[in-house]
């Protein structure tokens, strides 16, 4: 049996990472031991799973790495890799400084809003997560059909504005659809804008007929699929 140890300490010499906002950061703590150790990450001393981070994080345990894409000022801090097995534990601290960049178009978290399947009569939430230097505003749009067509003569889609909101940077914006019907099915777009420009992402809502209670004991209100 052997306590954890760093296998490539020369790759960990760069303790301070100062990167421009929008860049990708990768921290690695390659280690070994017997039994094979596990790795956990802390941010400023607290367990870090990235759930509150736009874009989330990528943990690649086989590479002993933490990857954060499109870093923002709120990502600044001390990142600790904690490697442990039954025999012992080791840790290493990285310091991340995010250099603020010029204001840019809003960045929307990938995969949001998410394609969603729901049953008639259920409630649906579509999420949109925005990062913007300048204060963003959001619109929720539904793509509609007019005279049998989804597009006008100019080639642009017909849309209906469902909701407009001004939000704080890095806030989650939610579109609530209550008691959905077949007519609610279709394409929904989250539009985020600031003084630099607009960004859009879309998702599809599929609405299934009401399930027969004799066949289904309990159906979830909504299923989220990527």
């Amino acid at each position: 049996q052997q306590a954890p140890y760093w296998t490539h300490p020369q790759r960990m010499e760069k303790k301070l990472h100062a990167v421009p906002a929008g860049n990708t950061v990768k921290f690695r703590c390659p280690a070994a031991g017997n039994p094979t150790p596990t790795i956990r990450w802390l941010k400023d001393g607290q367990a870090f799973h990235g759930e509150n981070r736009i874009g989330g994080i990528r943990l690649r345990h086989q590479h002993w790495s933490l990857v954060m894409e499109s870093v923002v000022p709120s990502d600044r801090g001390t990142y600790t890799c904690l490697v442990e097995n039954a025999v012992g534990s080791i840790r290493y601290n990285y310091l991340l400084d995010v250099l603020e960049r010029s204001p840019h178009r809003p960045i929307l978290q990938a995969g949001l809003p998410a394609n969603t399947t729901a049953v008639v009569g259920s409630d649906v939430e579509l999420l949109c997560k925005v990062y913007s230097d300048a204060q963003p505003h959001i619109q929720w749009l539904k793509h509609i059909v007019i005279n049998g067509s989804s597009f006008g003569a100019d080639g642009f889609p017909y849309v209906q504005v469902l909701k407009t909101a001004d939000i704080n940077s890095s806030e989650v914006e939610v579109l609530y659809l209550r008691n959905v019907s077949a007519e609610d099915a279709g394409e929904y777009t989250c539009l985020a804008g600031n003084s630099i420009g607009l960004s859009y992402q879309s998702a599809w809502l599929t609405v299934l007929p009401e399930e027969d209670p004799t066949w289904t004991a309990a159906a979830p209100e909504a299923r989220y699929t990527d």
């Epitope: 504005v161 804008g193 003084s195 960004s199």
Partner: antibody, heavy 124, light 112 residues
Amino acid sequence: EVQLLESGGGVVQPGRSLRLSCAASGFTFSSYAMHWVRQAPGKGLEWVAVISYDGSNKYYADSVKGRFTISRDNSKNTLSLQMNSLRVEDTAIYYCVRGAGRGYTYGPDGFDIWGQGTMVTVSS
Amino acid sequence: DIVMTQTPLSLSVTPGQPASISCTSSRSLLHSDGKTYVYWYVQKSGQPPQLLIYELSNRFSGVPDRFSGSGSRTDFTLKISRVEAEDVGVYYCMQYIEAPLTFGGGTKVEIK
């Protein structure tokens, strides 16, 4: 017809001030960010500043930061550029440009409509 | 700041012949929403710039279909399939992804 009309240009000595205005018509001015772009004689285009639709956000090129102030009066459909401590290198045609709208737009989200420009000459 | 580098500086074209202008950005202009925010303008003598192409390849309303934009991430091209006398002017590319918005140095197109 969508239109932007700049005014206020002229000849001024280095160190002095000048205020440019841009009158907007033919669109809902209060729903659009607005920019100033300049072009020195015989040279290329240089972005100067932007202001959000409600005036809450303003950004400037490093070359004018601390000297120029962008502002707007949505009740009068007017965009302004207050230029202080003018330098010889500020000599240029100043264009007012429509930026991104507050909501869904068909086509480009801004930088589609330019004014005719107003000439500013800084010379001793 | 994002640097936009345009080539060539000038171009002399026979009417009816094609013309091509290149533009390179110092950083990718492909945004998280999947769009590439490069715009192309032409500036004719004594006039403000006029928008030709937006978001890499979309022709602005009223722009003849002999103009086309293409490219990806950092390398962009404006093509005129058959140059006409009215196409004389200075052509600029612009990045519209972050402030400060930046322009290429311009390409002067003249007729032989």
